[in-house]
């Protein structure tokens, strides 16, 4: 999906209002400095591409983030403010339901959510401190 035509201001507002709080709750008891940055993004559409990938694509060491509250809200926000996004996600959602499994929060999932927080921080920072 190409995130170029999303309403970035509305997504930022949703993130600050709800998604950020859910991410921080998930990370409770963990310092952001516990994990090094292993993923970055270079503009707002790129940030959303990487956020979608980390949130919804299961990895061998962390398979279950898509069912978390922050992931549900992320999905709803993208569907609301990115034209045509929800249609592209139907097949992916059906495939995910088939492999649904209850999870335990592993250190690798905490690391992945720490990376997500970093990506969202870059997304809401429209400019570097200086040019």
């Amino acid at each position: 999906y190409d995130f170029t035509n999303c309403d970035f201001q509305k997504i930022e507002a949703d993130y600050l209002r709800t998604i950020s709080k859910d991410l921080i709750t998930y990370m409770s008891g963990t310092k952001s400095t516990d994990f090094n940055n292993t993923v970055s993004c270079s503009n707002r559409p790129h940030c959303l591409t990487e956020i979608q990938s980390l949130t919804f694509n299961p990895t061998p060491r962390c398979a279950s983030l898509a069912k978390e509250m922050f992931a549900r809200k992320t999905k709803a926000t993208l569907a609301l403010w990115c034209p045509g996004y929800s249609e592209t996600q139907i097949n992916a959602t059906q495939a995910m339901k088939k492999r649904r499994k209850r999870k335990v929060t592993t250190n690798k999932c905490l690391e992945q959510v720490s990376q997500l927080l970093g990506l969202w921080r870059r997304f809401i920072r429209t400019l570097l401190k200086k040019q």
Partner: antibody, heavy 122, light 109 residues
Framework: QMQLVESGGGVVQPGRSLRLSCAAS????????MHWVRQAPGKGLEWVAV????????HYADSVKGRFTITRDNSKNTLNLQMNSLRAEDTAVYYC???????????????WGQGTMVTVSS | SYVLTQPPSVSVAPGQTARITCGGN??????VHWYQQKPGQAPVLVVY???DRPSWIPERFSGSNSGNTATLTISRGEAGDEADYYC???????????FGGGTKLTVLG
Amino acid sequence: QMQLVESGGGVVQPGRSLRLSCAASGFTFRTYGMHWVRQAPGKGLEWVAVVWYDGSYTHYADSVKGRFTITRDNSKNTLNLQMNSLRAEDTAVYYCARSPQWEEIFEAMDIWGQGTMVTVSS
Amino acid sequence: SYVLTQPPSVSVAPGQTARITCGGNNIGSKSVHWYQQKPGQAPVLVVYDDSDRPSWIPERFSGSNSGNTATLTISRGEAGDEADYYCQIWDSSSSLVVFGGGTKLTVLG
């Protein structure tokens, strides 16, 4: 852990070519800008080139423009530097380094490789 | 093109504060990064965006930037701080990375 490993250095005659490679691991390579920086024996750091996270744009130092080409293969997590028409003054340790980028701005180089030595001599 | 000027050498007594400067035209409008390089090793980022510090760097390292001078400050200097230090900026107007010439820090004694 996050790592960059350079290879391909060696001794080469003036006017010849050499290709350096940098293998990345431990991070999502496709999301970072990547640089080559060199250091001549006993001298300071000299920036050589940078390639955007997606390979779409490149920038070069004037001293290597037209002779060196920086490329990346995000499917293989590798960075390359093709060096043509080599000169004695290109003798240096060559480092690859990653940096986050925001739009056209490159940020600090937070991870560096250990370097590979290139000697241009007849 | 943009030029960054550093003193070739700075000395500090153990336990004292070292300040390494990096001069450039209106450098305060740019983000400055600092690297430490020990002999035979690759550079290591110690301060980025003027004054931020990577999580693995001790609090003794700090930075500031205004006007025409950026400064790296190393408090309570230790023998292990002996190294070359380089400032660096991204020059947006020319799309080039610029490094300072480097400063050799010597810890006396």
